[in-house]
């Protein structure tokens, strides 16, 4: 009886794993084996596909074959018993185009209100993604084990920290990789769960802000308790992208080591141009807090995004605010040749209830004020460009009294 050639050959490539699957054409014929040949582009001869010769099942693995993943390849299969079937040719394909990104490896570390996620490519030193290692981004889905309500986080790198979690709570997450340059989305990792710890005695510092004063950077933060010492560390932001490397060499800022105030001042020349992460830790001598949230610090933007300077003209029921260019040392205005949005916060001096106005214009009216009442105003600038999504610190608050009720404009 003539053997029929196998049909429906599927090529599955996940990372560096090359798997072939096919259907038997004739289930009634026993003891049939299958063999593959391959042919590279521009070659006439067919070569035996190692790992896929005389296979008794309907699946084989040819991962050991060292292929150029960007080069087109053709496969053919036949059935063998005493005689052989005709060859069945599989549509040619380019491994890189066909490849899927496998599930990444995930390593979790827990704090009381945060989880650190370390992500590595599923295949170490992958040949398939050798040129794309630094281009991987990841996305994750996280949920409280008790509730199942999912939160998605997109565009993260090989180290990511999730904050504002609840202590003593189990969180579960799964991660997938993407190569946006090649329009490839990977498959999810298995689900990983971790329980946050009991609440730490000392909370981490909060609300870290960097501003520029003269030739110095001023780093400020808030802290709950007095009589503490603080230390500040920095890391090049690009190091979070480094696949497979999970040794992060955070560095001390010398002028911010064991400081006893909730701010520190250090020269601008501590940092070369670049994007950095900054974090702060508190200690009372016996106990240490976990590290604060890491803030992104871009020297280029920081250097030129200063808080706005403004004048207030007071009326009975409103303020007119005129925003000018910020002043550098020496009272020279800073020229800012990129569009800004201004955020103006105002409040009655005797109250904590703040109101906010967002304006593109440099002359702003603050309406609906009470006569003969002291209001305070502070402002900050935001870049409008999404790529330079940056905010200045707030200006110092300026307080003014509104005019009596009969003031006309």
């Amino acid at each position: 009886k003539n053997l029929k050639s196998p049909q429906k050959v599927e090529v599955d490539i996940i990372d560096d794993n090359f798997i072939l699957r096919w259907n038997r054409s004739d289930e009634s014929v026993g003891n049939v084996t299958f063999s593959f040949d391959y042919q590279k582009t521009g070659m006439d001869n067919w070569i035996k596909l190692s790992g896929c010769q005389n296979i008794t099942s309907t699946k084989c693995n040819f991962s050991s074959l060292k292929l150029n993943v960007y080069e087109e390849i053709k496969l053919r299969i036949r059935a063998e018993k005493e005689n052989t079937s005709s060859w069945y040719e599989v549509d040619s394909f380019t491994p890189f185009r066909k490849a899927q990104i496998g599930p990444p490896e995930v390593h979790l570390e827990a704090e009381d209100k945060a989880i650190v996620i370390h992500i590595s490519p599923g295949t170490k030193d992958s040949v398939m993604w050798a040129l794309d290692g630094l281009s991987f981004t990841y996305s994750l889905v996280i949920w409280k084990n008790s509730s199942g309500v999912e939160e998605r986080i997109e565009n993260i790198y090989s180290r990511h920290k999730i904050y504002k979690l609840s202590p003593e709570t189990t969180y579960c997450l799964k991660v997938k990789a993407a190569l946006l340059t090649s329009w490839k989305i990977g498959v999810y990792s298995p689900v990983h769960c971790i329980k946050t710890t009991v609440e730490n005695e000392l909370p981490p510092p909060e609300n870290i802000e960097v501003s520029v004063q003269n030739q110095n950077y001023v780093l400020k933060w808030d802290y709950t308790y007095a009589n503490m010492t603080f230390q500040v560390q920095w890391l090049h932001a690009f190091l979070k992208r480094n696949p497979g490397n999970h040794l992060y060499k955070w560095k001390q800022i010398p002028d911010c080591e064991n400081v006893k105030t909730t701010q520190c001042v250090f020269p601008q020349n501590v940092f070369q141009k670049g994007i950095y992460l900054l974090r702060v830790q508190a200690s009372d001598g016996n106990n240490t807090s976990f590290w604060s949230e890491e803030i992104k610090f871009d020297t280029e933007i920081q250097a030129f995004l200063l808080p706005p300077v403004f004048n207030i003209r007071s009326l009975s029921d409103s303020f007119h605010i005129y925003i000018g260019a910020p002043k550098q040392s020496g009272n020279t205005p800073v020229i800012q040749d990129y569009p800004l949005i201004y955020e103006i916060i105002f409040w009655e001096n005797t109250s904590n209830a703040e109101r906010k106005i967002i304006e593109k214009k440099t002359d702003v009216t603050v309406p609906n004020l009470k006569p003969l009442t002291v209001y305070c105003v502070k402002a900050r600038a935001h870049t409008m460009d999404e790529k330079l999504n940056k905010s200045s610190v707030f200006s110092d608050a300026v307080c003014e009294k509104t005019k009596p009720g009969n003031t006309s404009k």
Partner: antibody, heavy 118, light 107 residues
Framework: EVRLQQSGAELVQPGASVKLSCTGF????????MHWVKQRTEQGLEWIGR????????KYAPKFQGQATITADTSSNTAYVQVSSLSSEDTAVYYC???????????WGQGTSVTVSS | DIVMTQSQKFMSTSVGDRVSVTCKAS??????VVWYQQKPGQSPKVLIY???YRYSGVPDRFTGSGSGTDFTLIISNVQSEDLAEYFC?????????FGGGTKLEIK
């Protein structure tokens, strides 16, 4: 194959100094931290400190601050610890260890025995 | 400094048994704990890192658990080659500190 090779045993006088070496094979010490750990006979492990060979930044346990000095020479892929003002309390085995991913001391040298005796 | 306390200096067990080695930190260290095994006359070797991750090549009879201040190393189906001293270490903040060690004796 990753390996840490430490210098040979030392017999030193009280009050003197000793400098121990640890050479890395199969990896570049610049990409890691290099730690030093002390272990006295039938005692636990004590962390002395570590260096980042890339920029020579060091951290020390308060107990060893001033007594131990950790250095590194990236050209020879070697880390060193110098311990000064030695006393009988410093008779111990000194280990170097590589600080790798997740800050784990993942590879250890074979240890150097230091005996302080007159 | 963070003090790591291993309350049991010695533990005696038999081949095939299950044994738990405990370690307590003087303050919350998250999951930043490593367990080492040191056999007589040898250097320490990593068993478990980040409280629960088994280091590559370590047999799966070694399991780590815990977070915050309380950590446990479990050796199930103890083998004669597990005769060693076991140390915990915190890597949460400098100075790194080790527990005093627990010696496992095989009956």
């Amino acid at each position: 194959e990753v390996r840490l090779q430490q210098s040979g045993a030392e017999l030193v006088q009280p009050g003197a100094s000793v400098k121990l070496s640890c050479t890395g094979f199969g990896f570049n010490i610049k990409d890691y931290y290099m730690h030093w750990v002390k272990q006295r006979t039938e005692q636990g492990l004590e962390w002395i400190g570590r260096i980042d060979p890339e920029d020579a930044e060091t951290k020390y346990a308060p107990k060893f601050q001033g007594q131990a000095t950790i250095t590194a020479d990236t050209s020879s892929n070697t880390a060193y610890v110098q311990v000064s003002s030695l006393s009988s309390e410093d008779t111990a085995v000194y280990y170097c260890a590589r600080g790798g991913n997740f800050y784990v001391m993942d590879y250890w040298g074979q240890g150097t025995s230091v005996t302080v005796s007159s | 400094d963070i003090v790591m306390t291993q309350s049991q200096k010695f533990m005696s067990t038999s081949v095939g048994d299950r044994v738990s080695v405990t370690c307590k930190a003087s303050q919350n260290v998250g999951t930043n704990v490593v367990w080492y095994q040191q056999k007589p006359g040898q250097s320490p070797k990593v068993l478990i890192y980040s409280a629960s991750y088994r280091y590559s090549g370590v047999p799966d009879r070694f399991t780590g658990s815990g977070s915050g201040t309380d950590f446990t190393l479990i050796i199930s189906n103890v083998q004669s080659e597990d005769l060693a001293e076991y140390f915990c270490q915190q890597k949460n903040s400098y100075p790194y500190t080790f527990g005093g060690g627990t010696k496992l004796e095989i009956k």
